[in-house]
Each structure stands twice: as structure tokens, then as C-alpha cells.
Interface confidence: medium
């Protein structure tokens, strides 16, 4: 079979929350992407930010390949990670307001994933191995959530290490692409 990047083949696995692989050292060089792989549109900027509301909870995007051992996605995926503090934006510059808002004994507002998206990706493997279709779970949006000192452990656990380690964010996934298209590292797959 041909190994077109824009084909419809392979299996999918969704990594557990918080078990996503670290992005590779090098970010994607957009110039290497051909039109079929990229749909004619440039990928998101590596660290493009977007304010979600008056709270400074930001959605950061970066581009990376998804890998599973020697196999790599035919095209990169755009990961979304949640970042920023969650006091009202107008209070953040104010030391008093911030101090009051972030009192250790008071409520803790965290910027955490709100919605997830299951993204299908096609993995291409070396040595003539069959391509694989994999499914990765990616953050689709972020929100500020109020956590208390009594339940922040369990609440954060629900989101894996996303809140604690935003650098491990994920990107929303398309579902209709070739079964050969993308995959994420599967040490966290289930």
C-alpha cells in the first residue's frame, strides 16, 4: 500500500489522562509540511495564546508529532495546554487583590481542562510495518475551576498531570482521518 500522508488506515489507542508523552525537542518546521498533510493551512504557532474569559486562564497551543516507539504520526498534532492563574484579570496586577485571592487557606482557582476531544491519528512505522490508527485524548478547552484544600488532590487526579504539568498538554483530535495518520506515545495508552 502507498504511504500517502493523507490516507485512511490504522488502529487507535487513547492514552490515559496525564500520561501523554513529552513533546519532542524540536518543534515542527511548518515549511516541511505539504499541502495534503496540512490541508493548505499553516499549523498553530508553537505558543499561540488565547484568553478564555476575564480570568487569565490561557489555552496554549504547540505543534508536535505523536510517536509510539519507532512509529510517528504522518502529520503533527496541535497540542492545547491550560496555563495561567485564575484570578479575575483586573485583580492579578494588584498585589493586595492577588494576595487575598491566593490566600493559602482560601479557595484555589486553577486553570484546568474543561472539554476533551478524541483525536484519531495515523502512525507510520519503519521497516514495512503496517501503519496504525491510534486515538489520543486531547484537551479541547480550558476553564478556571475552584478547588478547596480538602479536595484538590482528588480533583486534580481526575485531570491527570495536565494541571500540574501543563507542558504535557494535548491537542484536540480529528476523527476522520486515515487510519494511518497519527498516534501518541502509548506508555499511557489503554
Amino acid at each position: 500500500q502507498g504511504w500517502q500522508a493523507f490516507k485512511n488506515d490504522a488502529t487507535e489507542i487513547i492514552p490515559e489522562l496525564g500520561e501523554y508523552p513529552e513533546p519532542p525537542p524540536e518543534l515542527e518546521n511548518n515549511k516541511t509540511m505539504n499541502r495534503a498533510e496540512n490541508g493548505g493551512r499553516p499549523p498553530h504557532h508553537p505558543f499561540e495564546t488565547k484568553d478564555v474569559s476575564e480570568y487569565s486562564c490561557r489555552e496554549l497551543h504547540f505543534t508536535r508529532y505523536v510517536t509510539d516507539g519507532p512509529c510517528r504520526s504522518a502529520k503533527p498534532v496541535t497540542e492545547l495546554v491550560c496555563s495561567g492563574q485564575c484570578g479575575p484579570a483586573r485583580l492579578l496586577p494588584n498585589a493586595i487583590g492577588r494576595g487575598k485571592w491566593w490566600r493559602p487557606s482560601g479557595p484555589d482557582f486553577r486553570c484546568i481542562p474543561d472539554r476533551y476531544r478524541a483525536q484519531r491519528v495515523q502512525l507510520l512505522c519503519p521497516g514495512g510495518e503496517a501503519p496504525r490508527a491510534r486515538k489520543v485524548r486531547l484537551v479541547a478547552s480550558c476553564k478556571c475551576k475552584r478547588l478547596t484544600r480538602f479536595h484538590n488532590q482528588s480533583e486534580l487526579k481526575d485531570f491527570g498531570t495536565e494541571a500540574a504539568r501543563p507542558q504535557k498538554g494535548r491537542k484536540p483530535r480529528p476523527r476522520a482521518r486515515s487510519a494511518k495518520a497519527n498516534q501518541a506515545e502509548l506508555e499511557n495508552a489503554y
Epitope: 493523507f6 490516507k7 485512511n8 488506515d9 490504522a10 488502529t11 487507535e12 489507542i13 487513547i14 496540512n38 490541508g39 493548505g40 493551512r41 499549523p43 498534532v77 496541535t78 476531544r117 478524541a118 483525536q119 484519531r120 491519528v121 495515523q122 503496517a130 501503519p131 496504525r132 490508527a133 486515538k135 491537542k171 484536540p172 483530535r173 480529528p174 476523527r175 476522520a176 482521518r177 486515515s178 487510519a179 494511518k180 495518520a181 497519527n182 495508552a189 489503554y190
Partner: antibody, heavy 117, light 111 residues
Framework: QVQLLQPGAELVKPGASVKLSCKAS????????MHWVKQRPGQGLEWIGE????????DYNENFKSKATLTVDKSSSTAYMQLSSLTSEDSAVYYC??????????WGQGTSVTVSS | DIVLTQSPASLAVSLGQRATISCKAS??????????MNWYQQKPGQPPKLLIY???NLESGIPARFSGSGSGTDFTLNIHPVEEEDAATYYC?????????FGGGTKLELK
């Protein structure tokens, strides 16, 4: 060539269960998700769910979560769908289909399930 | 769930003419530069056959008279020139979001 073989028909009684099979050949069974689709007589297509043969992971359409159970037997490259508590609403043709990243590229011929006493 | 609305429900086209089928999604099926819309052909007593995937990509073995276009929420399947063997029901299907959903179908008949 890729083939998905399904039995032609099943006749079952109301309230009973039935286990449909789909034997795959011509490709690496564990490299593609297997989907199941329902089509009632003269009607459109409904996606039931999918299973990843490499690890048994399943994803279901909420409408079928209490109706269908998907499994696979890797040793025989066969996917199964069990339908439970059958009623006349379950009378339909059920297709298995190989799933890629974008679409279902190969389909079985379908198994016609008739629920009748 | 994403709802796909196909139109027309049926159409009659003369041999050699163009058949155009529309599919509108209740929300965008685009993601990261790709459109997760597919088209299938189904004849009576047969399973569906994949024609077009990712909005505009022709599946292997499918004649070039079939073409797909569109993005976001509006998609089109074109058949030109229509041949006798094209009489069938055509379905659009989105795979951008679970559950995968299908349009209601368009029955193509020959005049």
C-alpha cells in the same frame, strides 16, 4: 485482499441475545479499529461503536451502550458484537467495517438479524 | 451529536449529466486543517462503499467522476458524468466527533 466475512442471517426470539461475528483477513487485524453499523430495513445508517483489536478498547454510541457489547479474538482475527434483550426494534442488518483515521474503508456484507417469536 | 442533513432526499439525473448532493453539518467537522467528512455509496442488498474521505480525497479504485468538496459545515458530492451504475443511495458521514454520524441519504435515480 481485505475481506470481512459475516454470517448472512440470524433469527432470534424477543428477549434473547445474539452474538454476531466478523472474520477479518487480508490485512493486519490489530492495526485497524473495527466498527459496527446498524441499518434498519429501508432506513439509514447508525454507528454503534468500535473496538481496537490490539487492546480490546471500545467506544460506543451512547444509544447502544446498553444494547451492544464489542469483543475480539485476536487469534482468529474475528470481531464480535453481542446484542442483548432483543426487541423488534433490533431487527436490522448489522455491518462490521474496518476503520481508518477518517472513514470506514472496507465493509462486511452484513448480517440480517430478525427478532421474532 | 453532530446532525448531518442531506439534500435533496432524491434526485433524477440523465446519463452523462451532473449530480450534486449536499450535506450540511450542525457544527463544523473541521479540525486542524482537515475536514472529517466522508461519502459512501450503497446499492440495494449491498454494504456501503467508501467513495470520498476527508471531504475531497478519492478512495482507491473509485472512478474520477466522483468528487467531493467543502469545509466547515457545508459539503458537496459531485458525480459527473453520471453513469448507469451510479444509481444508488449516497450517504455523507462525519468522523470529527464521536459518535460518528451519517446523513439521511440521497437516492440517485436515472432519468
Amino acid at each position: 485482499q481485505v475481506q470481512l466475512l459475516q454470517p448472512g442471517a440470524e433469527l432470534v426470539k424477543p428477549g434473547a441475545s445474539v452474538k454476531l461475528s466478523c472474520k477479518a483477513s487480508g490485512y493486519t487485524f490489530t492495526s485497524y479499529w473495527m466498527h459496527w453499523v446498524k441499518q434498519r430495513p429501508g432506513q439509514g445508517l447508525e454507528w454503534i461503536g468500535e473496538i481496537n483489536p490490539s487492546n480490546g478498547r471500545t467506544d460506543y454510541n451512547e444509544n447502544f451502550k446498553s444494547k451492544a457489547t464489542l469483543t475480539v479474538d485476536k487469534s482468529s482475527s474475528t470481531a464480535y458484537m453481542q446484542l442483548s434483550s432483543l426487541t423488534s426494534e433490533d431487527s436490522a442488518v448489522y455491518y462490521c467495517a474496518r476503520g481508518g483515521v477518517y472513514a470506514m474503508d472496507y465493509w462486511g456484507q452484513g448480517t440480517s438479524v430478525t427478532v421474532s417469536s | 451529536d453532530i446532525v448531518l442533513t442531506q439534500s435533496p432526499a432524491s434526485l433524477a439525473v440523465s446519463l452523462g449529466q451532473r449530480a450534486t448532493i449536499s450535506c450540511k453539518a450542525s457544527q463544523s467537522v473541521d479540525y486542524d486543517g482537515d475536514s472529517y467528512m466522508n461519502w459512501y455509496q450503497q446499492k440495494p442488498g449491498q454494504p456501503p462503499k467508501l467513495l470520498i474521505y476527508a471531504a475531497s480525497n478519492l478512495e482507491s479504485g473509485i472512478p474520477a467522476r466522483f468528487s467531493g468538496s467543502g469545509s466547515g459545515t457545508d459539503f458537496t458530492l459531485n458525480i459527473h458524468p453520471v453513469e448507469e451504475e451510479d444509481a444508488a443511495t449516497y450517504y455523507c458521514q462525519q468522523s470529527n466527533e464521536d459518535p460518528w454520524t451519517f446523513g439521511g441519504g440521497t437516492k440517485l435515480e436515472l432519468k
